[in-house]
């Protein structure tokens, strides 16, 4: 039926062209909501990560670049640390004694994973090299 | 209700050892929250701390005293003890055990043991 | 050490007085300093805390004031029970030390 008629290729040149493209840099726009979806099924990779990588920084050393966990909550709270002096306070009016160790607040990030993702390889735990 | 209660021997002969264990009643000797101490008051006289402890073990003492002080915690009894070597008869005094807060604003004494009258004497 | 000097070390008092009672530390402890009342055979009793800071269930007439070396105990309407001696006693720094007492008695 498509050598006779070509309609499949019809119907794709009229989709192409109902979008009106000015240049050739819109056309990935296109296949990028065409794939997506598929890609992300297959892997997803932590832009956190690869901007750490690109800025050099040792923490991204050991990490992956498959991203494993797509929901996540984080908590910012203040505990009470213990001091070698009061030189190592966050600030003179957050600095205090219990008589024996010096103390001071510290803000503290705590991140909990809730939901990992929906892909192929999240749960491979393949060396990224 | 947070209870504290001093028990040992009244009586101590000169050069020997004095040993006295503080028991802790409804709450935990584990918790993180607080320090153990051991102040004394000799008769008609003011009061003297003569050192503290963590449930880890952590002790501090006083200076005065240090040489002759060994203060220890057993959590699964839920006591802590003092011991005080070489004693003399200006080791006559009424022993308190009590604790102050760790982590808080100054080390305040909010409980106390009743006391107990230790005498040195042969 | 800090070394803790009150004044007076004894007073007469009548009920209804206003009492007051100094503590002066021989170096600068900031607010670390606390008050107890103590009555003969009994353990001393935490009135006030971090200087000013009033111990749960401590009748509001005793309060308690000053910073660094200088600091003050007032009984604002003295009651029959009230007669005691009382220490303060510095949490600074250890040795934690004490004061040696004033006795307060009835006039």
């Known amino acids: 039926v498509e050598v006779a008629t070509h309609y499949l290729e019809i119907i794709t040149q009229l989709i192409v062209e109902s979008f009106h493209f000015k240049n050739g840099e819109d056309a990935p726009d296109l296949l990028k909501v065409i794939t997506k979806p598929f890609t992300k099924l297959i892997v997803q990779l932590d832009k956190k990560v690869i901007s750490q990588i690109a800025m050099n920084d040792e923490k991204a050393k050991n990490k992956s670049l498959v991203k494993i966990w797509c929901k996540t909550f984080t908590n910012k709270t203040q505990i009470n640390v213990t001091v070698p002096s009061t030189a190592n306070c966050t600030s003179p009016s957050l600095c205090w004694t219990d008589g024996i160790q010096n103390w001071t607040m510290k803000n503290v990030t705590y991140k909990e994973n809730i939901a990992k993702c929906q892909h192929i390889f999240v749960n491979f735990h393949l060396p990224d090299l | 209700q947070v209870q504290l209660q001093e028990s040992g021997p009244g009586l101590v002969k000169p050069s020997e050892t004095l040993s006295l264990t503080c028991t802790v009643s409804g709450g935990s000797i584990s918790s993180s929250s607080y320090y153990r101490g051991w102040i004394r008051q000799p008769p008609g006289k003011g009061l003297e701390w003569i050192g503290s402890?963590?449930?880890?073990?952590?002790?501090y003492y006083n200076p005065s005293l240090k040489s002759r002080v060994t203060i220890s915690v057993d959590t699964s009894k839920n006591q802590f003890s003092l011991k005080l070597s070489s004693v003399t008869a200006a080791d006559t005094a009424v022993y308190y055990c009590?604790?102050?807060?760790?982590?808080?604003?100054?080390?305040?004494?909010?409980?106390w043991g009743q006391g107990t009258l230790v005498t040195v004497s042969s | 050490e800090i070394v803790l000097t009150q004044s007076p070390s004894s007073l007469s008092a009548s009920v209804g007085d206003r009492v007051t009672i100094t503590c002066r530390a021989s170096?600068?402890?900031?607010?670390?300093l606390n008050w107890y009342q103590q009555k003969p055979g009994k353990a001393p009793k935490l009135l006030i805390y971090a200087a000013s800071s009033l111990q749960s269930g401590v009748p509001s007439r005793f309060s308690g004031s000053g910073s660094g070396t200088d600091f003050t105990l007032t009984i604002s309407s003295l009651q029959p029970e009230d007669f005691a001696t009382y220490y303060c006693q510095q949490s600074y720094s250890t040795p934690f030390t004490f004061g040696p007492g004033t006795k307060v008695d009835i006039k």
């Open positions: 009590a604790r102050h807060p760790r982590g808080s604003y100054g080390a305040n004494f909010d409980y």
């Open positions: 402890i963590y449930y880890s073990g952590s002790t």
């Open positions: 170096q600068s402890i900031s607010s670390y």
